[in-house]
Interface confidence: low
């Protein structure tokens, strides 16, 4: 309606004597700014005067000043939209209606606000959810329709008079819509909180009590149970009787059904609060509890562990592990159902009692073949001794033992023989399935564990065999000790270290690399002629005639071996020089004559020199001296000299006679 002033504020405000009131307020005038404001207490309209009568709590002045008696009431608004008020302190007789008389230039308005001031602080109000269940988080709310900036308060939660340790969240509202203080507490109630008193306490800033509200918690929960057993330790012997009683300590709402469970499974036809077990058997040992249900759900008691004691049952043996490998560790476990647990054990190996073994487990740190066999045990507790069960078999596996390589041939073995060896062993578990031989060769295995070496080599020194099951055991190698003729026979010159010159002292050595047997004989030969029987052949003064092809032989009882032929070369200066003439030593003038210097030398002559009868050297240095045409004055004695790397040699004189031709004689 456009003819009205528009106000917004809480309809009623609440406070108590000595507190304060804060009135949030907004307005919109019909025209222009506010020119006059009066706050009435319980205003009454006077028709005669056309004015409002009543106590004036506040009045605005032309200069905006507030008289000192008006300090208790404050107008905190402005001239166009805010009409907030504060009364501090507020008194009991302030209760009633507050009238806000507003005047603008042309319009007037009276706005009414209710104020409810009580003599004492009024209590807050606790709000609970419609249903509370154990262990489910709920929010408890404490609401107070009061808040004022000038009067701080606090709300505290108590459980059975004791402050609650959960943190509460307090919020305040001072708005045109609502004025309140609220505290919210998140809380997970347990069944034990059922029926307990929760208090929300209003306190001033100093923690002084002002007022409170209380509620009794109604916590829905499953039945809470206690189980009692006779005998109290729940330990009995077979044939005894046992009574269990289920007591409900709390249930909200009331319980509806009862049942009993053993090891989590419901016992049929047991729906009362007492469970009677008569003449119990060992099968009735287990964990018992009672279960009682209500609308929330089932509740279970703690478990009672009923132990029905009995003597050990026939025992069985568990072996970790069989088959066992020799040298490994093995553990035997005696398993026998008994209550109480067995305190003593007796162990048997192949029916014979094992001394000093009284524990549930027998540990053998290093298994040997003799540990194999049947193991059984007997368990004993306070109620008696059990029977010996069937036992368990321990199989001890091990590599083949005492493996040997045996030579089947008569000794000695000669190079080229056929050798047969066998691989023998003492015992094995599991059985030997194959054999191996070292070194590897292209050898024949005619049957399992037998090796045949055809045409045995001189260098076949040792052979080893292995007998194999799951593992291989190697025998010590055996020496074949193959006998053979001397090997790698050769001639070696010991001296001189350099080339051999005529007249040198010369030694030749007959070498060989190996021989089995070691006892040998030596033979030297040249051109099929035996020269000596020592390992060395010596020449005190070598001559060119000693040159030639030499061989040495070495023999033992197996055979004889010759070296390659070795050539002995003797170096010497030219010797046996002579001058030969062609066609002869008498030649007719005008013909040709050829003189040849013949010699024996090693190395061959490298340089020739010719001399005449006057010992004059001629300017010719080849082996042949050719005179053509020959002249009478060429007649005379000639000789030659030959030179090699060793030395020189000269020939005796040879005479050339040149005679006149018939023509020359005819002219004379």
């Amino acid at each position: 309606d456009s003819s009205k002033w528009v106000f917004e504020h809480p309809e009623t405000l609440y406070a108590w004597e000595g507190a304060c009131v804060w009135i949030p307020c907004t307005y919109r005038a019909l025209d222009g700014d506010l020119e006059s404001f009066i706050l009435f207490h319980n205003p009454e309209y006077n028709k005669n005067t056309s004015k409002f009568d009543g106590t004036r709590l506040y009045e605005s002045t032309k200069d905006g000043k507030v008289p000192s008696e008006q300090k208790r009431v404050q107008f905190l608004g402005d001239k166009n939209k805010n009409c907030t008020l504060s009364i501090h302190p507020v008194h009991l007789n302030d209760s009633g209606q507050l009238g806000l008389r507003m005047e603008s230039k042309t319009e007037k308005w009276m706005e009414r606000i209710h104020l409810n001031v009580s003599e004492r602080p009024f209590p807050p109000h606790i709000q609970l959810p419609p249903e509370i269940q154990e262990s489910q988080e709920v929010t408890l709310t404490c609401l107070l329709n009061f808040s004022c900036y000038g009067y701080p308060i606090q709300l505290q939660w108590l459980l059975e008079g004791v402050p609650m340790r959960q943190a509460a969240v307090t919020s305040t509202s001072l708005t045109i819509k609502s004025v309140f203080t609220r505290s919210e507490l998140k809380f997970s109630p347990q069944w034990s909180h059922h029926g307990k008193i929760v208090t929300c306490q209003l306190q001033d800033a100093d923690g002084k009590f002002l007022s409170n509200d209380t509620v009794q918690l109604n916590v829905k929960h499953t039945p809470k149970l206690e189980i009692k057993v006779t005998p109290s330790d729940a330990i009995v012997r077979e044939g005894d009787s046992v009574t269990m009683t289920c007591e409900v300590s709390s249930s909200n709402p009331e319980y509806t059904t009862v049942s009993w469970l053993k090891d989590g499974t419901s016992l049929k036809k047991q729906n009362t609060f007492t469970l009677n077990l008569r003449e119990v058997t060992k099968d009735q040992s287990g964990k018992y509890c009672c279960q009682v249900s209500n609308d929330v759900g089932p509740g279970r008691s703690e478990e009672v562990f009923l132990q029905v004691q009995y003597a050990p049952e026939p025992s069985t043996v568990q072996i970790l592990h069989s088959p066992a490998v020799e040298g490994s560790q093995v553990e035997f476990l005696c398993m026998s159902l008994a209550n109480p647990l067995p305190t003593n054990y007796t162990w048997y190996h192949n029916g014979k009692e094992m001394q000093g073994r009284t524990e549930e487990k027998v540990h053998i740190p290093k298994i040997l073949p003799w540990h194999a066999g049947t193991y059984s045990c007997v368990a004993e507790n306070i109620l008696g001794t059990g029977q010996r069960g069937p036992g368990a078999e321990l199989d001890v596996q091990y590599p083949p033992k005492k493996v040997t390589t045996v030579i089947q041939n008569p000794m000695p073995i000669r190079e080229g023989d056929t050798v047969t060896l066998s691989c023998n062993y003492n015992s094995s578990n599991p059985s030997v399935t194959r054999y191996e031989w070292k070194p590897h060769g292209a050898w024949e295995e005619p049957s399992l564990g037998v090796l045949k070496i055809q045409n045995v080599g001189w260098d076949n020194t040792t052979i080893a065999c292995a007998a194999c099951n799951s593992w291989c055991s190697w025998a010590s190698p055996v020496a074949l000790n193959v006998q053979y003729a001397p090997r790698d026979v050769r001639v070696r010159k010991i001296k001189p270290l350099s080339e051999i010159h005529s007249g040198n002292s010369v030694s030749l050595q007959c070498d060989f690399s190996s021989s089995h047997p070691k006892e040998v004989q030596f033979f030297w030969e040249k051109n099929g002629r035996l020269l000596g029987k020592e390992s060395q052949l010596n020449f005190d003064s070598i001559s060119p005639e000693d040159a030639g092809s030499y061989s040495c032989w070495v023999n033992n009882s197996i055979g004889q071996t010759a070296s390659k032929a070795w050539t002995l070369e003797v170096l010497y200066a030219p010797r046996r020089l002579r001058v030969s003439m062609s066609p002869g030593d008498q030649v007719m003038e005008g013909k040709s004559a050829t003189l040849t210097c013949e010699s024996d030398a090693n190395p061959p002559v490298s340089h020739y020199t010719w001399f005449d009868w006057n010992n004059q050297s001629l300017p010719y240095h080849s082996q042949k001296l050719r005179l053509e045409p020959v002249k009478v004055q060429h007649s005379g004695a000639y000789w030659c000299q030959g030179t090699n790397s060793v030395g020189k040699g000269r020939s005796p004189l040879s005479t050339l006679t040149v005679y006149y031709s018939p023509e020359t004689i005819g002219r004379r």
Partner: nanobody, 118 residues
Framework: QVQLVESGGGLVQAGGSLRLSCAAS????????MAWYRQAPGNQREYVAA???????NYADSVRGRFTISRDNDKNTMYLQMNSLRPEDTAVYYC????????????WGQGTQVTVSS
Amino acid sequence: QVQLVESGGGLVQAGGSLRLSCAASGSTFSLNTMAWYRQAPGNQREYVAAASSDGYTNYADSVRGRFTISRDNDKNTMYLQMNSLRPEDTAVYYCTWGTGRFADYIYWGQGTQVTVSS
């Protein structure tokens, strides 16, 4: 004839890890054992660990708890996972092969160098 090829060696700081591999080829015996030996300069060859094709494993006291030996029989490959390495683990590591579970190691690899720096 069995050929063995090692790999995975190298330089690592003390406390670090390495994984050695050894690939075998030419093997014919179904039950065999592969092992690791090592040789530090100036020392004799020292046994490290062994693993047979049927699952048996064994370790030298000096490496037990730090080294783990394993085998992939399908790939004919052996591995040595070396953790918490120490300077004294520095050596040439050799892979070996032999028949049976308690093998006589007939074949040896060329070796791979492992150096642990402090």
